[in-house]
Interface confidence: low
C-alpha cells in the first residue's frame, strides 16, 4: 500500500558557475501514470516527459522515465538563476523546487595608483579592483610571499543589478629590500574552485648606494699585483667612484675608476684606502687598510676591511 | 683565524621548516658580518642572505625574501637561518661564511671563511 509520500517528486538545490553546465534532476517513486514537467522560474514549461516544450537549444533532455526526469542548462547566464519547479500532475498536483544560484566570475583584478621614483622610507597606497563577482569577491594583498593588510575589501553592486566590483588598497612603506618587489593583488571567490585570479604591479625604490672594497688577491704581497675592487650597490647603481688615500691633508686623490690598480705593490703603499660610491641618491664610502706583506710564501691575512 | 662548524640541515617536506645553526670560533665573531650561501646540485654557489655586525642590517637574495630569516646571538657566537614554506629548489647544500670585514657581502669573493655545509633536501 503505497503511501500519500511515494507521488511527491524531490529534487536537490544547485549551485552552478556562469557559463557553465546545471543538471536538474526530479525523481519520484510513484508516478500514477503521471508524466514530470520541469518548468522554469518564469513559470514557462521547459520539458514534459521527454517531450521539450520551449525553444532553447541550451536545455537537452539527459534522462525521461516514469521515475525520473533530468534536463541540463548549458551556458548558464546570470539571468537564469531562481526557482525551477518539478510538477506531476496527479490528483492533486505535487510539486518540488530547485533552487538555481549562478556565480559571477570576478574579472582579473586590475592595480592602479602606482607611482614610479619611489625612494626608501617613502610610503606607497595601491589600489585594486576586480568586477563581476556574485556574490562579491575577497581580495587580499601580498608582497612575494608576505600578506600585506589592506583595508577591508569595499563592495558595490554592478549595473546589472546582480553582480559587485569589489576594491581594496594597500598602505605601506617601502624598503631597500622592496626594490624589484611584485606586490600581488589575489581575488579569492568560490567560482575559482581554488584557481589563482590575480595581478601583479612590480615596483621600483631608489635607495642610497652601499659599498664594499673587496681585493684581488685576497691576501697581497710586496711585487704582486693587487686590485681594489669597489663594489657598489643601490638604485640607481653607483656611477661615480672616487679612491683616496688616508692620512695626507687633504686626502690624497687616486682615480674615479670603480678599480683601484697597484701594478706593482711596494711597502710604502701600505696604508688605508677610500672609495666614495656616488650616485644620484647620495654618497657611501668604505675603507681598506692594505698592509703589504713581505713578499715570502708564508700564508698571512693582515690585511684588513673597515 | 676563523672556524665555522654548522648543523641543523635534514630532509623536509614542502611547506615544512628548518633552522639552520654556524658556531663560530677564532677570532672575535661580533666585529664581523656574516653570510649564508647555497650550491644546488649543478649549480654556482649563490647568496641567500648577509647580516652585519650588530644585527641590525640585513640582505636577502630574492628568493628568500619573505621566507627565511638570518639571525645571530653574539653572547653565544651563532649564526642562524631559520627557513620556512620551504620548496624543492632549495634543496641545496647550504654555507655560513664570514668576510674578514664587518660588512656584509653579496658575492661569494667577499668571503674568507666558510663552513663545512649542511645539505637540506625538501621533497616530500
Known amino acids: 500500500n503505497l503511501s500519500q509520500d511515494d507521488s511527491q517528486p524531490w529534487t536537490s538545490d544547485e549551485t552552478v558557475v556562469a557559463g557553465g553546465t546545471v543538471v536538474l534532476k526530479c525523481q519520484v517513486k510513484d508516478h500514477e501514470d503521471s508524466s514530470l514537467q520541469w518548468s522554469n522560474p518564469a513559470q514557462q514549461t521547459l520539458y514534459f516527459g521527454e517531450k521539450r516544450a520551449l525553444r532553447d537549444n541550451r536545455i537537452q533532455l539527459v534522462t525521461s522515465t516514469p521515475h525520473e526526469l533530468s534536463i541540463s542548462i548549458s551556458n548558464v547566464a546570470l539571468a537564469d538563476e531562481g526557482e525551477y519547479t518539478c510538477s506531476i500532475f496527479t490528483m492533486p498536483v505535487r510539486t518540488a523546487k530547485s533552487l538555481v544560484t549562478v556565480l559571477g566570475i570576478p574579472q582579473k583584478p586590475i592595480i592602479t595608483g602606482y607611482k614610479s621614483s619611489l625612494r626608501e622610507k617613502d610610503t606607497a597606497t595601491l589600489n585594486c579592483q576586480s568586477s563581476g563577482s556574485k556574490p562579491a569577491a575577497r581580495l587580499t594583498w601580498r608582497k612575494g610571499d608576505q600578506e600585506l593588510h589592506g583595508e577591508p575589501t569595499r563592495i558595490q553592486e554592478d549595473p546589472n543589478g546582480k553582480t559587485f566590483t569589489v576594491s581594496s588598497s594597500v598602505t605601506f612603506q617601502v624598503t631597500r629590500e622592496d626594490d624589484g618587489a611584485s606586490i600581488v593583488c589575489s581575488v579569492n571567490h568560490e567560482s575559482l574552485k581554488g584557481a589563482d585570479r590575480s595581478t601583479s604591479q612590480r615596483i621600483e625604490v631608489l635607495y642610497t648606494p652601499t659599498a664594499m672594497i673587496r681585493p684581488d688577491p685576497p691576501h697581497p704581497r710586496e711585487g704582486q699585483k693587487l686590485l681594489l675592487h669597489c663594489e657598489g650597490r643601490g638604485n640607481p647603481v653607483p656611477q661615480q667612484y672616487l679612491w683616496e688615500k688616508e692620512g695626507s691633508v687633504p686626502p690624497l686623490k687616486m682615480t674615479q675608476e670603480s678599480a683601484l690598480i697597484f701594478p706593482f705593490l711596494n711597502k710604502s703603499d701600505s696604508g688605508t684606502y677610500g672609495c666614495t660610491a656616488t650616485s644620484n641618491m647620495g654618497s657611501y664610502k668604505a675603507y681598506y687598510t692594505l698592509n703589504v706583506n713581505d713578499p715570502s710564501p708564508v700564508p698571512s691575512s693582515s690585511s684588513t676591511y673597515h | 683565524q676563523v672556524q665555522l662548524v654548522q648543523s641543523g640541515g635534514g630532509l623536509v617536506q614542502p611547506g615544512g621548516s628548518l633552522r639552520l645553526s654556524c658556531a663560530a670560533s677564532?677570532?672575535?665573531?661580533?666585529?664581523?658580518?656574516r653570510g649564508w650561501f647555497r650550491q644546488a646540485p649543478g649549480k654556482e654557489r649563490e647568496f641567500v642572505a648577509a647580516?652585519?655586525?650588530?644585527?641590525?642590517?640585513?640582505n636577502y637574495a630574492d628568493s628568500a625574501k619573505g621566507r627565511f630569516t638570518i639571525s645571530r646571538d653574539n653572547s653565544k657566537n651563532t649564526l642562524y637561518l631559520q627557513m620556512n614554506s620551504l620548496r624543492a629548489e632549495d634543496t641545496a647544500v647550504y654555507y655560513c661564511?664570514?668576510?674578514?670585514?664587518?660588512?656584509?657581502?653579496?658575492?661569494?669573493?667577499?668571503?674568507?671563511?666558510w663552513g663545512q655545509g649542511t645539505l637540506v633536501t625538501v621533497s616530500s
Open positions: 677564532g677570532r672575535t665573531f661580533s666585529n664581523y658580518a
Open positions: 661564511a664570514a668576510p674578514a670585514s664587518r660588512r656584509p657581502s653579496w658575492d661569494a669573493d667577499g668571503y674568507d671563511y
Open positions: 647580516i652585519d655586525y650588530s644585527g641590525g642590517s640585513t
